[in-house]
Amino acid sequence: NYQNGKNNVPRLKLSYKEMLESNNVITFNGLANSSSYHTFLLDEERSRLYVGAKDHIFSFNLVNIKDFQKIVWPVSYTRRDECKWAGKDILKECANFIKVLKAYNQTHLYACGTGAFHPICTYIEIGHHPEDNIFKLEDSHFENGRGKSPYDPKLLTASLLIDGELYSGTAADFMGRDFAIFRTLGHHHPIRTEQHDSRWLNDPRFISAHLIPESDNPEDDKVYFFFRENAIDGEHTGKATHARIGQICKNDFGGHRSLVNKWTTFLKARLICSVPGPNGIDTHFDELQDVFLMNSKDPKNPVVYGVFTTSSNIFKGSAVCMYSMSDVRRVFLGPYAHRDGPNYQWVPYQGRVPYPRPGTCPSKTFGGFDSTKDLPDDVITFARSHPAMYNPVFPINNRPIMIKTDVNYQFTQIVVDRVDAEDGQYDVMFIGTDVGTVLKVVSIPKETWHDLEEVLLEEMTVFREPTTISAMELSTKQQQLYVGSAAGVAQLPLHRCDIYGKACAECCLARDPYCAWDGSSCSRYFPTAKARTRAQDIRNGDPLTHCSDGGIEGRMDHHHHHH
């Protein structure tokens, strides 16, 4: 099992068969009349994983996903027929693919689906308490899903439901051309991004949405959208994709005379994830695939983990980049992108920026405006024509923390767990791929926190057939990882300490923060446990100083390889 060597060779490589035989994976292989298990909602409190799929919503027990309840939510035959008449595929498109699944309140979820190219939403009753065991579709209350779910199941929605309002980045039309960021539900008029203006959004593909506080005053709260889109002409020669982070103020209610029912605080910036290449030309990983926010002690400053792939068909690569919110804010406070000059190039705007600065939330903190409807006309005019920032956001340390270019797969998903080890805290990344494998990677600081070494601990095949991993959730409570694909859902423990071997040296060399040698076996490390001695060295993986002679004796060169 155990492989010592270069960091990009997994310490453990486990096939699906090996995962099954060692009881390290539980799979729900889908229903015959469903597929596309792509929309996840984790509820640690109720110990449930809600999954939206084709014509179904599932409620899986986090302890064992073999124990589940299901809601069947298909489309009527008439909707299906209409969809078919519109030239769509009856099996792959003319069904209700669930795209939005969010907690609405203490007792209900809010769900939206494609509805066979006729988006539809409803509420799901889940009861007050886990023991209520309620999981029921409110079939008396359906809502129009336009601007909430895409029409086309191939498209994603990035959504966030807070205080009874749904923020969603999606396509709002049948043709999949009118992409927008919306706010719907709630008591206010729906708000959206400007229509048919490529400066705002240029054929985007939305990844995720997150609420991040800006200050201690909730009036300053912002919603951040992560997406990728076509680069605007002049930003790049030829067709290119750019990864983006967009911001909007939670208390944005649109303009009064201009930008009525449109965002007035929308700004976007480019996310850079690149490595220096030959001839001084950087190799860019521009196709943002997934984002994970690792919360820190300060809720205003989560660490952003992004998974990127290359746009090139020739060069296939993946990377993980980390971003700090302080860098993001610095860019949003920097120069706006402005088109000027003889070639109509993008340049930093040098003129007078109106007050209050576009992108600032109306609040007591930063100025005297109570509502975006009170903003002066020059602010609104400027906001409409300057949605993009000139400076990009560079990753921490100006480079990816991990790249993979020599493999026949690409990264698709990421979740991160912060683990307490004997010698400090470590971030363990679980990275999903397009071939149904999960990579477990630990970031190890070298001299400084900014200088990280990546150690690929495990490569696990979690589905029987190669399939793209399209959803991932991590339960710290259960110490389990949940993985979704077109084919089904898989559940696996975050650690398999016993597999690292039967000796202290092997346990130590593994450098897995979850595991330590307890004197007789390689087992889960608990920082609170008052064990006599726990041998573990994540930073250096040095068994000589951490293992007694008995633990090392005759074991150092006895490694198993699993292929």
Epitope: T78, E82, W85, A86, R146
Partner: antibody, heavy 116, light 111 residues
């Protein structure tokens, strides 16, 4: 009660144009696809065109393609059929029909006569 | 020439059972739902049967529809004089990307 009321029919010369309207009530118009079906005097039914509930998709019979345009205004609960380059064989009663996997409700029709 | 083929006429006496056939191909009846429409003299058509065999509310259970392969049929039992009308079958045609009707069957109630 579902009601569909067509208007705009009449006598027109060959090569001329007409715009038919269909006012809908008694159901959520913006939730349903709509269609036009015609019936030449003494003949059977012929499907003409249909439009998706949000105008996202439009389809036409080969006999009218390029000459007729279907549209709708969901804020006014109204369906339209713009007919250009009319021919004698377009003479018919034009029915507006609500689409629900089939034509579940029909208007009373409006007569279009194309004279040469 | 209609894509779906129906007999031009059918007849029966009150109380009798009458069947009207409709034949098509795999691109219409074979792979799509069949509907039947009734058109009383001088009025607009009315939906009689949808999804091969289902009746909308208000349609008497004397009317029934069935489908087998690329053919469909409408049966009217306990024939009444008010059933005298033109009957059309219809289905979506996947290869034409359009809705197709049969030529219609004129039902006469004798006596």
């Amino acid at each position: 009660e579902v009601q569909l009321l067509e208007s705009g029919g009449g006598l027109v010369q060959t090569g001329g144009s007409l715009r038919l309207s269909c006012a809908a009530s008694g159901f959520t118009f913006s939730d349903y696809a709509m269609s036009w079906v015609r019936q030449a005097p003494g003949k059977g039914l012929e499907w003409v065109s249909w439009i998706y509930y949000d105008s996202g998709s439009k389809y036409y019979a080969d006999s009218v393609k390029g000459r007729f345009t279907i549209s709708r205004d969901n804020s006014k609960n109204t369906l339209y059929l713009q007919m250009n380059s009319l021919r004698a064989e377009d003479t018919a009663v034009y029915y507006c029909a609500k689409l629900n996997g089939d034509f579940d409700y029909w208007g009373q029709g409006t007569l279009v006569t194309v004279s040469s | 020439q209609s894509v779906l083929t129906q007999p031009p006429s059918a007849s029966g006496t009150p109380g009798q059972r009458v069947t009207i056939s409709c034949s098509g191909s795999s691109s219409n009846i074979g792979n799509n739902d069949v509907s039947w429409y009734q058109q009383l003299p001088g009025t607009a058509p009315k939906l009689l049967i949808y999804a091969d065999s289902h009746r909308p509310s208000g349609v008497p259970d004397r009317f029934s529809g069935s489908k087998s392969g690329t053919s469909a049929s409408l049966a009217i039992s306990g024939l009444r004089s008010e059933d005298e009308a033109d009957y059309y079958c219809g289905a979506w045609d996947s290869s034409l990307s359009g809705y197709v009707f049969g030529g219609g069957t004129k039902l006469t109630v004798l006596g």
